[in-house]
């Protein structure tokens, strides 16, 4: 049930790897260290996951419970419009850039924030349990 295209969703899946948190049908990894956006993306990909792509406001609200004031990288970038790493547009929340270098997206308990991709931040990975192909 968890197999399929890269951007499908998980259904009822086994438990998550160590240091990953199971929430709903996905596993989430909240980093302790900090990296820039690209390095955070690489970290997630190396673990058969992806930087967090949030599917709707409900998921965002639930995840924010686990967040603090500190911003975390998520799979959101501004390439001629804010888009998630799965290619879908950001359409359930708002994010605005204050400068031309703020092309990567981050989240904290208060919401989304545009940032320069070079800033070292915590990050959140998301995947189906046990490295199934369905990442989002």
């Amino acid at each position: 049930l968890c197999q399929g295209s890269n951007y499908s969703t998980c259904a009822s899946c086994p438990s998550c790897p160590d240091r990953w948190m199971k929430y709903g049908n996905h596993c989430y990894y909240f980093s302790v260290e900090e990296k820039d956006w690209n390095s955070s993306l690489e970290f997630c990909l190396a673990r058969d996951s992806h930087l967090l792509v949030i599917t709707d406001n409900q998921e965002m609200s639930l995840l924010q419970v686990f967040l603090s004031e500190a911003f975390c990288w998520i799979g959101l970038r501004n390439n001629s419009g804010w888009r998630w790493e799965d290619g879908s547009p950001l359409n359930f929340s708002r994010i605005s850039s204050n400068s031309f270098v703020q092309t990567c997206g981050a989240i904290n308990k208060n919401g989304l924030q545009a940032s320069s991709c070079e800033v070292p931040l915590h990050w959140v990975c998301k995947k189906c349990p046990f490295a199934d192909q369905a990442l989002f």
Epitope: N98, S99, V101, Q102, A114, S115, S116, E118, V119, P120
Partner: antibody, heavy 120, light 107 residues
């Protein structure tokens, strides 16, 4: 407390060169874009240069492009401005400035400035 | 390049007065505007970003408004320490241009 201390200003002849330094303390230097802003005597503020966190991207207005080079040493918490082919119109107080964080490119913190005089 | 034009270039007012300084952009800059205060012989001090958001520690008598091309900085009740020169600045893209300044003097 954020502190930015500029040095290296002085009198230089037209066509000459000068290197300004800005020592940063009180914050994690390697998390912020940094800039230079200048002010000619009795005049307004003019943005001179901005450098990204890693130093890989630099930005200049046309008035100094090709003559000024901004750089940084994150290990030493120091920002630099190498100025060459100096002209009389480059005479100004040069301020080092830090952005607001996350790439918010307003100038949230300023040094006290260092005076550069270009004159024969 | 975007040009920033401030008015008036100088202004005389008294302690307790309400003062408004205007900054106009040559094209739409949305809310990408900052304000600074500078006293003679001193470095500028950051007051406001994104047209209306007060910097930490800035007194609430300062406020910013506007979007698009027309912006204002308002001081609701002038204090002696507010007499200075004020600059607006476009902060979204290159070049980061400043207004020419407005000098606020004691009447």
């Amino acid at each position: 407390e954020v502190q930015l201390v500029e040095s290296g200003g002085g009198l230089v002849k037209p066509g000459g060169s000068l290197r300004l330094s800005c020592a940063a303390s009180g914050f994690t230097f390697s998390r912020y874009y940094m800039s230079w802003v200048r002010q000619a005597p009795g005049k307004g503020l003019e943005w001179v240069a901005t450098i990204s966190i890693s130093g890989g991207n630099t930005y200049y207005p046309d008035s100094v492009k090709g003559r000024f080079t901004i750089s940084r040493d994150n290990a030493k918490n120091t920002l630099y401005l190498q100025m060459s082919s100096l002209r009389a119109e480059d005479t100004a107080v040069y301020y080092c400035a830090r952005e607001g964080g996350y790439g918010n490119l307003w100038f949230a913190y300023w040094g006290q400035g260092t005076l550069v005089t270009v004159s024969s | 390049d975007i040009q920033m034009t401030q008015s008036p270039s100088s202004l005389s007012a008294s302690v307790g007065d309400r003062v408004t300084i205007t900054c106009r952009a040559s094209e739409n800059i949305y809310s990408a505007l900052a304000w600074y205060q500078q006293k003679p012989g001193k470095a500028p001090k950051f007051l406001i970003h994104s047209a209306k958001t007060l910097a930490e520690g800035v007194p609430s008598r300062f406020s910013g408004s506007g979007s698009g091309t027309d912006f204002t900085l308002t001081i609701s009740s002038l204090q002696p320490e507010d007499f200075a020169t004020y600059y607006c600045q476009y902060h979204y893209g290159i070049p980061f241009t400043f207004g020419q300044g407005t000098k606020l003097e004691i009447k």
